[in-house]
């Protein structure tokens, strides 16, 4: 009786069970009941990534310098180009096809996390005691001046976008 | 502008050596399979070998082995081919080429002609 | 190693004419590249994976075949396609690239 389903590494054709293609090699005829599958290997600047069936091999992504992208790891008959993006860049997308300049955090915010080539920066509200008063991909939060340890008082409050105001202690007391 | 820029027209002696070499511009040598083809004149392409600059791994077709060496340098994104023990049927013009992608298509370098005489 | 015939090794045509160059491989490859070469000049990738043309190639040339026989056609030959065009398997080390095809003018 013809099987209906088969093994892994196999597929089903013509009421038989035939090996699937090796990563790296593409199918060019199908097993018969006297031969085996027959694959070829892909060619230079293509690829197949999987156990296959597939009559074409795929061919290496492009890592297009225009679109801000650089290529991390070259492909292999087993695997694709992994692209990047240049510096002060990250990807759109998880394939990254193209890039996009990193955000910068505004006045207010400071950076969580640094952007890499395939995340964008992440920001953050700076808290209480922390300000920020440029627009950076770089900084973080920083604290508010410690007017006491320089024997100074606050004379202007901080806020989220600047630092506190020190000045001299008022002589005058009551 | 991008390319791979070869160096001049060499004249040697037999049993002599001569270096080769293709210098990238405008592109990262680094992403590419270099490829190195003769062609001795008025005949055919030869295909010689293939070095990945990345790492220096090297191919050679049978017939070059040993005759021929191919080295990278990335931080100069130039690759070398050096011939040895030069011979008169080593006279031919020496070709670099890189692997293509969809959309760069290979370049080709402008070629280095070889002489080989006593 | 592969050993890679092209045919015929010369021709001469005249502008309009349609073109055939066959390429046979001594054992199955998996793609054919092909190549064209003008006197003096670098040579340049026309068609790549059997029958993709390359950016700025015109569409007069075409690639087909499969297994160890390939074919490039032109469909009507051009003044400026008069050169020598090669065919190059890089499926198996060593890479092999015919004897190539010399068109001339008739």
């Known amino acids: 009786e013809p099987p209906t389903a088969c093994r892994e590494k196999q597929y089903l054709i013509n009421s038989q069970c035939c090996s699937l293609c090796q990563p790296g090699q593409k199918l060019v005829s199908d097993c018969t009941e006297f031969t085996e599958t027959e694959c070829l290997p892909c060619s230079e600047s293509e690829f197949l990534d999987t156990w296959n069936r597939e009559t074409r091999c795929h061919q290496h992504k492009y890592c297009d310098p225009n679109l801000g992208l650089q290529v991390q790891q070259k492909g292999t008959s087993e695997t694709d180009t992994i692209c990047t993006c240049e510096e002060g860049l990250h990807c759109t997308s998880e394939s990254c096809e193209s890039c996009v300049p990193h955000r910068s955090c505004l006045p207010g915010f400071g950076v969580k996390q640094i952007a890499t080539g395939v995340s964008d920066t992440i920001c953050e509200p700076c808290p209480v005691g922390f300000f920020s008063n440029v627009s950076s991909a770089f900084e973080k939060c920083r604290p508010w001046t410690s007017c006491e340890t320089k024997d100074l008082v606050v004379q202007q409050a901080g806020t989220n976008k600047t630092d506190v105001v020190c000045g001299p202690q008022d002589r005058q007391r009551a | 502008q991008v390319q791979l820029v070869q160096s001049g027209a060499e004249v040697k002696k037999p049993g002599a050596s001569v270096k080769v070499s293709c210098t990238a511009s405008?592109?990262?040598?680094?992403?590419?399979?270099v490829h190195w083809v003769k062609q001795a004149p008025g005949q055919g392409l030869e295909w010689m070998g293939r070095?990945?600059?990345?790492?220096?791994?090297?191919k050679y077709a049978p017939k070059f082995q040993g005759k021929a060496t191919m080295t990278a340098d990335t931080s100069t994104s130039t690759v070398y081919m050096e011939l040895s023990s030069l011979r008169s049927e080593d006279t031919a013009v020496y070709y670099c080429?890189?692997?293509?992608?969809?959309?760069?298509?290979?370049?080709w370098g402008q070629g280095t002609l070889v002489t080989v005489s006593s | 190693d592969i050993q890679m015939t092209q045919s015929p090794s010369s021709l001469s045509a005249s502008v309009g004419d349609r073109v055939t160059i066959t390429c046979s491989a001594s054992?199955?490859?998996?793609?054919m590249l092909w190549f064209q070469q003008k006197p003096g000049k670098a040579p340049k990738l026309l068609i790549y994976?059997?029958?993709n043309l390359a950016s700025g190639v015109p569409s007069r040339f075409s690639g087909s075949g499969s297994g160890t026989d390939f074919t490039l056609t032109i469909s009507s030959l051009q003044p400026e396609d008069f050169a020598t065009y090669y065919c190059?398997?890089?499926?198996?080390?060593?890479?092999?690239f015919g004897g190539g095809t010399k068109v001339e003018i008739k």
């Open positions: 994976s059997t029958s």
């Open positions: 054992s199955s490859v998996s793609y």
């Open positions: 405008g592109f990262n040598i680094k992403d590419y399979y």
């Open positions: 190059q398997q890089r499926t198996f080390y060593p890479y092999t």
């Open positions: 080429t890189t692997s293509y992608y969809v959309g760069t298509y290979g370049y």
């Open positions: 070095i990945d600059p990345e790492d220096g791994d090297s």
